[in-house]
């Protein structure tokens, strides 16, 4: 029986050009984590295997850094990075746990966000 739960950073926003940390945490289970996959939609971003360490997909190598911990740091954000991210925990003996994070990358600076919502 799978008793564990995944806590994530939930819905987060960040500024274009900036960076963000995607974090998931598996709790309420004694299952051994053998591997964590990070995916964006159906695209593999990174893998962290307990034995083999980190692998960052070549197409993301310049903008994705492993950690902290089992998390993932996205750098040089663009508006195209907006969307769903999934942390997939492979555990033994429980099986697979999946967490979801929604990232919104905002155009430009806080000052400009303010301007966007000004009442005429």
């Amino acid at each position: 029986m799978m008793t564990g739960t995944i806590e994530t950073t939930g819905n987060i926003s960040a500024e274009k050009g900036g960076s963000i940390i995607l974090q998931c945490h598996l709790s309420s289970t004694t299952a051994q984590v053998t591997q964590v996959n990070w995916e964006q939609q159906d695209q593999l971003l990174a893998i962290c295997n307990a034995d083999l360490g980190w692998h960052i997909s070549p197409s993301f190598k310049d903008r994705v850094a492993p950690g902290p911990g089992l998390g993932l740091t996205l750098q040089s954000l663009t508006v195209n990075d907006t969307g769903e991210y999934f942390c997939i925990y492979h555990t033994y003996p429980d099986g697979t746990y999946t967490g979801r994070i929604f990232l919104e990358v905002l155009e430009s600076s806080v000052a400009e966000h303010g301007a966007r919502f000004q009442i005429p």
Epitope: I47, D51, L52, G53, H55, Y92
Partner: antibody
């Protein structure tokens, strides 16, 4: 260019010992996973041992059950060289021994060194 | 006996598409990543496919890897005489903490 060069193979009697070396160039051996894989004459590939990078799991080592307790993988970071100390050798250890670099797939291999265990 | 089963031999004619299978028990396929190696006669193995379907730089796109159900496979399209070699599938076993290789498939180009 990344290269691996094995040496140290030869003819040894059952129960004897040999130390294989894998000299590497083009990368820092301590920062990468390096494995030993063997191939008995006319047979397929068999994984022997892996040394992980020092920045993951403190350079933990892994062994196939068939060699556990008899073989020891080690590294000399200053020489950028990997070793396989083989003790209590058996006839079934006769094979070409390759060292190979990589964690998510072994992407660079040496040319191999031949170990023959026979009386 | 390996937990990965490959046909001992396969063959095809130049220009043909050939598929080499590698089957395992259910518990291995779904959550594992698979790798394919090519070993030309008298040479060391070469990584052909990693993480199920990714090609290292320098590997022609004639080679492709896929995974479905209880089997993974390597497809070679536009078969060439220089593709005659032994092909091995492999995966890292998280419980044994080691690499597991299939028995290998000898590909003959007729």
């Amino acid at each position: 260019e990344v290269q691996l060069l094995e040496s140290g193979g030869g003819l040894v009697q059952p129960g004897g010992s040999l130390r294989l070396s894998c000299a590497t160039s083009g990368f820092t051996v301590s920062d990468h996973y390096v494995s030993w894989v063997r191939q008995a004459p006319g047979k397929g590939l068999e994984w022997v041992s892996t040394s992980s990078s020092t920045n993951w799991n403190d350079g933990r080592t892994y062994y196939a059950d068939s060699v556990k307790g008899r073989f020891t993988i080690s590294r000399d970071n200053s020489e950028n060289t990997l070793y396989l100390q083989m003790n209590s050798l058996r006839a079934e250890d006769t094979a070409v021994y390759y060292c190979a670099k990589g964690s998510y797939g072994m992407d660079v291999w040496g040319q191999g060194t031949t170990v023959t265990v026979s009386s | 006996q390996s937990v990965l089963t490959q046909p001992p031999s396969a063959s095809g004619t130049p220009g043909q598409r050939v598929t080499i299978s590698c089957s395992a028990s259910n518990s291995y396929i779904g959550t594992k990543y698979f790798y394919w190696y090519q070993q030309l006669p008298g040479t060391a193995p070469k990584l052909l496919i990693y993480l199920d379907s990714q090609r290292p730089s320098g590997v022609p796109d004639r080679f492709s890897g896929s995974k479905s159900g209880t089997s993974v496979s390597l497809a070679i399209s536009g078969l060439q005489s220089e593709d005659e070699a032994d092909y091995y599938c492999a995966f890292w076993d998280d419980h044994l903490h080691g690499w597991v290789f299939g028995g290998g498939t000898k590909l003959t180009v007729l």
